[in-house]
């Protein structure tokens, strides 16, 4: 007896983090025997969408012409062949930015920091939020979460880095979010350039890979040291 049908592959173009109003295409790739593709969104009535396969029948396209809150969430896809439905794909998390006003990102004491010293990146929102995310451009694992322990909302989150090395240098942005949907993020903050001076080691060029790419051993996220700031926020690496 044949085993279960292989699970399809699910991905989004141009990526899985999309600004409000922009278009995104979700692709589901199965096998040449596929007769129909189905996309399901977590916590929504199923099927979310159904599409006939594109020639040569091994994939289907699900188009979102204009990103809104309704489309943000966690997706899986399936395909139907003559012998039945496939296993579900691995999940795709589609995140929308632009749901809230942009926070402000600053560096304390300064964005110009000497290697070996400490710096704290401060993300501040005008309205209270319970999740803050720090993103470093071109990092393979760009997300660092600070999330409220008990739903207590905060106007800011601190991301301490100590001791600073040349690897910490680069361009950062932060986002804020409400816990009721971590698929909805604020507009990004204006970029903050962190410049590390006085280092004897050569700065490594940051790999130009997409957010969704798996990290290699040299691209692991930098864990800030020190205790969690006294803000009721808990640190999560994603």
């Amino acid at each position: 007896q044949a085993g279960p049908l292989p699970k399809p592959t699910l991905w989004a173009e141009p990526g899985s983090v999309i600004s409000w109003g922009n278009s995104v295409t979700i692709w589901c790739q199965g096998t040449l025997e596929a007769r129909e593709y189905r996309l399901d969104k977590e916590e929504s009535p199923a099927p979310w969408d159904r599409q006939n396969p594109l020639e040569p029948k091994n994939k289907a396209r699900f188009s979102i012409p204009s990103m809104t809150e309704d489309y943000a969430g966690r997706y899986r896809c399936y395909y139907r062949s003559p012998v039945g439905w496939s296993q579900p794909s691995d999940p795709l998390e589609l995140v929308m930015t632009g749901a809230y006003s942009k926070p402000t990102l600053s560096a304390l004491p300064s964005p110009l920091v000497t290697s070996g010293k400490s710096v704290t990146l401060l993300c501040q929102s005008r309205s209270p939020m319970d999740t803050f995310l720090l993103i470093k451009e071109r990092a393979a694992h760009p997300l660092l979460h600070l999330r409220s322990e008990h739903g207590a909302q905060q106007h800011q989150a601190e991301f301490p880095m100590s001791p600073v090395t040349s690897v910490h240098g680069g361009t950062y942005r932060c986002f804020s979010s409400h816990g009721f949907s971590h698929y909805l993020l604020s507009h990004p903050s204006d970029p903050l350039e962190l410049i590390v001076s006085g280092s004897l080691e050569d700065p490594r060029p940051s790999p130009t890979r997409s957010v969704s790419t798996a990290a290699g051993p040299e691209d692991q996220p930098l864990m800030p040291t020190g205790s969690v700031p006294h803000s009721g926020l808990r640190r999560h690496w994603e």
């Epitope: 969104k41 916590e43 929504s44 009535p45 199923a46 099927p47 979310w48 969408d49 159904r50 309704d70």
Partner: nanobody, 121 residues
Framework: EVQLVESGGGLVQPGGSLRLSCAAS????????MGWYRQAPGKQRELVAA???????KIGDSVKGRFTISRDNAKNSVYLQMNSLRAEDTAVYYC???????????????WGQGTQVTVSS
Amino acid sequence: EVQLVESGGGLVQPGGSLRLSCAASESIFSSNVMGWYRQAPGKQRELVAAVGINRLTKIGDSVKGRFTISRDNAKNSVYLQMNSLRAEDTAVYYCAAGAYVRFLQYSPDYWGQGTQVTVSS
């Protein structure tokens, strides 16, 4: 061939209840989200409720806490239970079927003919 057939509409007093039914062909029912829209005179069509093959539901904000939707797989039918009815619930109620994303876009694949609900004393 009519593929979605509604029933259960009528005249009811404010505060009363009605249960709408929609029978579908098996091929439509088994693979689609089923739901209800309504359209009052001079107003835009509004999504009232929807239920998926996974039994997860979406209830419109204006009827939350008063209306519930359910589906009976054995009978290929979907039901809209309407409680605490108000005058503003007066409308033609349409059964619909399709993928859920098309419910959000107000363009399901299949529509019923509609059944009139009038809430008046």
